[in-house]
């Protein structure tokens, strides 16, 4: 009897676990190519897809091109960024280039925004060259408000690779605050 | 004020070379990239080369690849363009052009070049 009882309060805890950890907000974006800025200058990236492909969101919203908080608490934030040239792509108008991503926290409460992360250098991708690549990786740590909005903003958008293993973005909710 | 003069077109024999020059003035001519285009009697204005600012990357039309070579002098403020084993076809008023705008890629479209020489007359004929 004491060994089925543990069995059933071990599946109930489990159950409980699974309910608690389903609910725990997270997001995965992935870029919507069809609609990339194009210019040199840095742009906010509104276009991506949370429901497609490797793209999921749970009690997360996503709208307007910024992933908003539901619920407070702690979040891992990250985003990975790949730019890439290939001759046929086009004329590259200049070899210099800064390959930048920042990712930012909008407040609507109190207006305002940050930076939470940037990443990025500055490169020299010589037009006459076939093929050039590089990738930009960021993630940290955040204490996040309900209602808090994340962009994602980069430097040259018309280098971006449009693949969804390529170009995403994410959060997930590891504990409440205190 | 932005101004581009060309220099250096005439009259050629199939298979002759020539050197066009462009003098440019009234911008900070290093920043940015230029470009020949060219233009035949009654037809399109079309691309014939670009190079940017720094004249690291050059880019050519298929028709004139391996013949002509574009190139810049930062300090003179000049662009170039050699002309070799020219042909009949390459018969066209030559221009060359400033692309200002803040884009990653360059145009080909001569309509996306905000300024531009009165051009020079090339002719390949014998």
């Known amino acids: 009897i004491r060994a089925e009882k543990a069995m059933v309060d071990g599946s109930w805890l489990d159950l409980a676990k699974r309910s608690k950890l389903e609910a725990q907000p997270f997001a995965h974006l992935t870029i919507n190519a069809t609609n990339i800025p194009t210019g040199s200058h840095k742009v906010s990236l509104s276009s991506w897809y949370h429901d497609r492909g490797w793209a999921k969101i749970s009690n997360m919203t996503f709208s307007n091109g910024k992933l908003i908080v539901n619920q407070d608490g702690f979040y891992y934030l990250y985003a990975n960024i790949c730019f890439r040239h290939h001759e046929t792509s086009g004329d590259l108008a200049t070899e210099y280039l800064q390959l930048m991503v920042y990712v930012t926290k909008t407040s609507i409460k109190i207006p305002s925004s940050h930076t939470l992360m940037k990443g990025g250098s500055t490169k020299y991708w010589s037009g006459n060259s076939e093929f050039h690549f590089y990738s930009i990786n960021v993630g940290g740590f955040f204490k996040l408000r309900s209602g808090e909005e994340i962009s994602v903003e980069v430097s040259n958008p018309s280098l971006l690779d449009p693949d969804q293993d390529a170009t995403y973005f994410g959060a997930f909710k590891v504990r409440d605050i205190d | 004020e932005v101004q581009l003069v060309e220099s250096g077109g005439g009259l050629v024999q199939p298979g002759g070379s020539l050197r066009l020059s462009c003098a440019a003035s009234?911008?900070?001519?290093?920043?940015?990239?230029m470009g020949w285009f060219r233009q035949a009697p009654g037809k399109g204005r079309e691309f014939v080369s670009s190079i940017t600012g720094s004249g690291g990357s050059t880019y050519y039309a298929d028709s004139v690849k391996g013949r002509f070579t574009i190139s810049r002098d930062n300090a003179k403020n000049t662009l170039y363009l050699q002309m070799n084993s020219l042909r009949p076809e390459d018969t066209a008023v030559y221009y060359c052009?400033?692309?200002?705008?803040?884009?990653?890629?360059?145009?080909?479209?001569?309509?996306?070049?905000?300024?531009w020489g009165q051009g020079t007359l090339v002719t390949v004929s014998s």
């Open positions: 009234g911008f900070t001519f290093s920043s940015y990239p």
């Open positions: 052009a400033a692309y200002i705008r803040p884009d990653t890629y360059l145009s080909r479209d001569y309509r996306k070049y905000d300024y």
